[in-house]
Interface confidence: low
């Protein structure tokens, strides 16, 4: 049985300040059941950017219909990028549970922010 992989195809993305950043993430399987979360940074101090299951993330939208059961694309768009958004973003698959437990992380995508074009 092939184990699920979390694929972040872009090692880095460069976006001008004020624009939107698209961070790509796909998974290779619907198994195991559980939500996707996006984080900036790694380790205990990482910042939650988006949780598929719950929460309010006004600057984040999903590129595809992430609630549909056959969906395997968990790419997100972050609007109105500022220099404070720079960092490495990780797409992380969780296994359903009580609580949900981390199953596998993507390799990360480094977001760099260019100066706003004059």
């Amino acid at each position: 049985e092939e184990e699920l992989q979390v694929i972040q195809p872009d090692k880095s993305v460069s976006v001008a300040a004020g624009e939107s950043a698209i961070l790509h993430c796909t998974v290779t399987s619907l198994i195991p059941v559980g939500p996707i979360q996006w984080f900036r940074g790694a380790g205990p101090a990482r910042e939650l950017i988006y949780n598929q299951k719950e929460g309010h993330f006004p600057r984040v939208t999903t590129v595809s219909e992430s609630t549909k059961r056959e969906n395997m694309d968990f790419s997100i768009s972050i609007s109105n990028i500022t220099p404070a958004d720079a960092g490495t973003y990780y797409c992380v698959k969780f296994r359903k549970g009580s609580p949900d437990t981390e199953f596998k992380s993507g390799a990360g995508t480094e977001l760099s922010v260019r100066a706003k074009p004059s």
Epitope: I31, T67, S98
Partner: antibody, heavy 118, light 108 residues
């Protein structure tokens, strides 16, 4: 054809134990999370417990936590539920149900009746 | 825990009529809601998942709609075999997974 066949129900006294089994056939058992759902006499449906596809994660309703244990043997295509410290309010038909993606139940067994009575 | 409230408790209709069943969630469950049919002495049967997608083999007279907290199951042109109890179930914020209390559709 997908088939789920429960067994092991019966009449027990309060405080006693029981083990329910669910034999699965007609699908790749190890590719699915599984659950037990019960229905008291003349009552609605109550989700009892669930288990991840390889058995590494289990979760329970508050009403049975610490008293019931869900497990599975993928080599035997069998789901189990051990019921300890049974109470009269545990009297119900216990259904084995296959979870689809997103945790709804696409196939159900016919159920096995557990009666707890002094 | 998300509470699902189904209404009405009982619906008395004649064959050929349309049944409209409601399910309200205490929190937003997006489109993560399923509907089941249960006849006396039988196990539940999946009708609708993802709020509006019909399960395999379910006739198109069954349709689901809604998202967020308010959902509807509509059975158009009721057939004799449709008289049963119907349950909704959320899977948007589980576990625990929760079911509604059920709506009985009976012959008038």
């Amino acid at each position: 054809d997908v088939q789920l066949v429960e067994s092991g129900g019966g009449v027990v006294r309060p405080g006693e134990s029981l083990r329910l089994s669910c034999a699965a056939s007609g699908f790749a058992f190890s590719d699915h999370d599984m659950s037990w759902v019960r229905q008291g006499p003349g009552e609605g449906l109550e989700w009892v417990a669930g288990i991840s596809l390889r058995g590494g994660v289990t979760w329970y309703a508050d009403s049975v936590k610490g008293r019931f244990t869900i497990s599975r043997d993928n080599s035997k295509n069998t789901l189990y539920l051990r019921l300890f410290s049974l109470r009269t309010e545990d009297t119900a038909i216990y259904y084995c149900a296959r979870e689809s993606w997103n945790t709804f139940f696409d196939y159900w067994g016919l159920g096995t009746l557990v009666t707890v009575s002094s | 825990e998300i509470v699902l409230t189904q209404s009405p408790g009982t619906l008395s209709l004649s064959p050929g009529e349309t049944a409209t069943l409601s399910c309200r969630a205490s929190q937003n469950v997006r489109s993560n809601l399923a509907w089941y049919q249960q006849k006396p002495g039988q196990a539940p049967r999946l009708l609708i998942y993802d709020a509006s997608s019909r399960a395999t083999g379910i006739p198109d007279r069954f349709s689901g709609s809604g998202s967020g907290t308010d959902f509807t199951l509509t059975i158009s042109s009721l057939q004799s075999e449709d008289f049963a109890v119907y349950y909704c179930q959320q899977y948007g914020n589980g576990p625990p997974l929760t079911f509604g209390g059920g709506t009985k559709v009976e012959i008038k």
